[in-house]
């Protein structure tokens, strides 16, 4: 009769056994054992006993201990198993953001491990327990899924392997994946709104707004705002589940035309996005051209108003004949235009918005001196000893200067409060001059005196 | 003992599809994964794709996406790998190899190889 | 994907006398588990490469103990500590860390 010993050994993968084997008749013929395994007798007394040492065991075997007695032939076998971790354990990759509402799939795959009878994979949220099934296949895959909550919002999932070799006087084995951290989002259906001018005038600063409720995590949520090819660099506030992104924008002549601005909020794996057309325009003020600004009385001016190509103007309230960028008038100087506001008003059509320009100059006319009876009255009578302002107003452009003399050297004290004397009374020059000539006027001071009453 | 036998050599033309065969005996089928290796003369052994036995999965090596169809018959205990589009440069021996889905552990047991020629 | 450097391309070795090839790799085969997924293999003329070490530095199963294998990283050496008739043939090592999983060019060894 042949004995093994152990009849049954777990041993790690790699790991080197002891095997006893064992007759019952003293004297056997053949004691020995089978196996493809490496093995190496080690020497004892005795004819009826042989130990053997079983290396580098890589899997299962059933190494088989024989002898052949006067009574016959006998064998019997030893149950070699071999137990080795897992080598991987994984859970198949996924987006780290997931939708609130979606279901997302966990996929765990392990790669090896012994016997697959103690193996057991078990799918976790945190250390709450999603899944456990036994480790079948390879890879063994196990599922399970889960429907994507806000408050999973920063969960992390695992898997992890339990190899229990405890009834077999072992340990528990644990290996456990990297963890996938899951990232939960809510990006509305709803587009972000965009407030922004429809039109912008070249070398001016707009200012443009998007915004958008309902949004989860909010602080996550990227901003994207652009005009053409130029990125905004906006201010972003941010509400509980909102944020509003403020930008300036400024154009050049080189972005004229009709420009896109877009406005993009990424979230998780996720984008809404608002277009919106701004055009941009180059609209200088009109022109407003005099023949010379500062002309003499009489001279003929012609005034011009000239605007942008597609603008319609008026010059003084008067459109242009035919209507268009271009209008002018003639006249010929009084000195009633010295002064005169000529006011040009342009009207360009931009993207159905009508904007006014105006541009305004003003003439200047060269004319005089004048004294005329009006203004500078010939003759004075006043009473002795009275108190009277002489007037006298030259007019002109420049203004004269104006001097009234007596013999030549007693002057009249024009404009000054005088008490009335004898030697007032007599007959002045008036003399207005300017850079535009001179003129005279006589002017006569009678004094009455009391006597005479 | 454990043993994988392929189908036998194969000649085709430029492009030809091929399917060969790899039997396995010897362990549970289901419970090692199934690699393709193949070996273009003067060239280094260059690996295709891997099986699971268990549940039909596959990946393949991204140089043979789409001209590779890896399939299972486990009734059969066989697994199979079929190459569409054949050109000259896939001239090679074609080896079925056992392991673990990953190879971690290495290609332990390996067929006889296949010889395939691609010749017009 | 990862290239792996053997050296020599050949050896030839004096029977009983020992041999070591190596294998450097073009980027780390330490994998995120900590494991290193770097394996060797023995193609004997007209025959299939036979597994002899798996990661690193295991013996597979009926690989005589004069086979070691050795390093970390990206440099690898095979050892045979006495070379024997029957070890002729080419030497590949191979990596299963990173995907596409790649071999080395090989290496001959031939008796002197």
């Known amino acids: 009769q042949t004995s093994v010993s152990p009849s049954k050994v777990i041993l790690p993968r790699g790991g080197s056994v002891l095997v006893t084997c064992s007759t019952s008749c003293d004297q056997p013929k053949l004691l020995g054992i089978e196996t493809p395994l490496p093995k190496k007798e080690l020497l004892l007394p005795g004819n009826n006993r042989k130990v053997y040492e079983l290396s580098n065991v890589q899997e299962d075997s059933q190494p088989m201990c024989y002898s052949n007695c006067p009574d016959g032939q006998s064998t019997a076998k030893t149950f070699l198993t071999v137990y080795w971790t897992p080598e991987r354990v994984e859970l198949a990759p996924l987006p780290s953001w997931q939708p609130v509402g979606k279901n997302l799939t966990l996929r765990c795959q392990v790669e090896g491990g012994a016997p697959r009878a103690n193996l057991t994979v078990v799918l976790l949220r945190g250390e709450k327990e999603l899944k456990r099934e036994p480790a079948v296949g390879e890879p063994a895959e196990v599922t399970t899924t889960v429907l994507v909550r806000r408050d999973h919002h920063g969960a992390n999932f695992s898997c992890r392997t339990e190899l229990d070799l405890r009834p077999q006087g072992l340990e528990l084995f644990e290996n456990t994946s990297a963890p996938y951290q899951l990232q939960t989002f809510v990006l509305p259906a709803t587009p972000p709104q965009l407030v922004s001018p429809r039109v912008l005038e070249v070398d001016t600063q707009g200012t443009v707004v998007c915004s958008l409720d309902g949004l989860f995590p909010v602080s996550e949520a990227q901003v994207h705002l652009a005009l053409g090819d130029q990125r905004l660099n906006p201010t972003v506030t941010y509400g509980n589940d909102s944020f509003s992104a403020k930008a300036s924008v400024s154009v050049t002549a080189e972005d004229e035309g009709t420009q896109r601005l877009t406005c993009a909020v990424i979230l998780g794996n996720q984008s809404q996005e608002t277009l919106q057309t701004v055009t941009i325009y180059s609209f200088p003020a009109p022109n407003v051209i005099l023949t010379k600004p500062e002309v003499s009385e009489g001279t003929e001016v012609t005034v011009k108003c000239e605007a942008h190509p597609r603008a319609k103007v008026t010059l003084n309230g008067v459109p242009a004949q035919p209507l268009g960028p271009r209008a002018q008038l003639l006249l010929k100087a009084t000195p009633e235009d010295n002064g005169r506001s000529f006011s040009c008003s342009a009207t360009l059509e931009v993207a159905g918005q009508l904007i006014h320009k105006n541009q305004t100059r003003e003439l200047r006319v060269l004319y005089g001196p004048r004294l005329d009876e009006r203004d500078c009255p010939g003759n004075w009578t006043w009473p002795e000893n009275s108190q009277q302002t002489p007037m006298c107003q030259a007019w002109g452009n420049p203004l004269p200067e104006l001097k009234c003399l007596k013999d030549g050297t007693f002057p009249l004290p024009i404009g000054e409060s005088v008490t009335v004397t004898r030697d007032l009374e007599g007959t002045y020059l008036c003399r207005a001059r300017s850079t535009q000539g001179e003129v005279t006027r006589k002017v006569t001071v009678n004094v009455l005196s009391p006597r005479y009453e | 003992q454990v043993q994988l036998v392929q189908s036998g050599a194969e000649v085709k033309k430029p492009g030809a599809s091929v399917k060969v065969s790899c039997k396995a005996s010897?362990?549970?089928?289901?419970?090692?994964?199934l690699h393709w290796v193949r070996q273009a003369p003067g060239q280094r052994l260059e690996w295709i794709g891997v099986i699971s036995t268990y549940s039909g999965n596959t990946d393949y090596n991204q140089k043979f996406r789409g001209r590779v169809t890896m399939t299972r018959d486990t009734s059969a205990t066989t697994a199979y790998l079929e190459l569409s589009s054949l050109r000259s440069e896939d001239t090679a021996v074609y080896y079925c190899?056992?392991?673990?889905?990953?190879?971690?552990?290495?290609?332990?047991?390996w067929g006889q190889g296949t010889a395939l020629t691609v010749s017009s | 994907d990862v290239v792996l450097t053997q050296t020599p391309l050949s050896s030839p070795v004096t029977l009983g006398q020992p041999a070591s090839i190596s294998c450097r790799s073009s980027q780390t085969l330490v994998y995120r588990n900590g494991n290193t997924y770097l394996h060797w293999y023995l193609q004997r003329a007209g025959q299939p490469p036979r597994l002899l070490i798996y990661k690193v530095s295991n013996r597979f199963s009926g690989v005589p103990d004069r086979f070691s294998g050795s390093g970390a990283g990206t440099d690898f050496t095979l050892k045979i500590s006495r070379v024997e008739a029957e070890d002729v043939g080419v030497y590949f090592c191979?990596?299963?860390?990173?995907?596409?999983?790649?071999f080395g060019g090989g290496t001959k060894l031939e008796i002197k």
């Open positions: 191979s990596q299963n860390t990173h995907f596409p999983y790649t």
């Open positions: 190899a056992r392991s673990l889905y990953f190879g971690s552990s290495g290609f332990d047991y």
């Open positions: 010897g362990y549970t089928f289901t419970d090692y994964a």
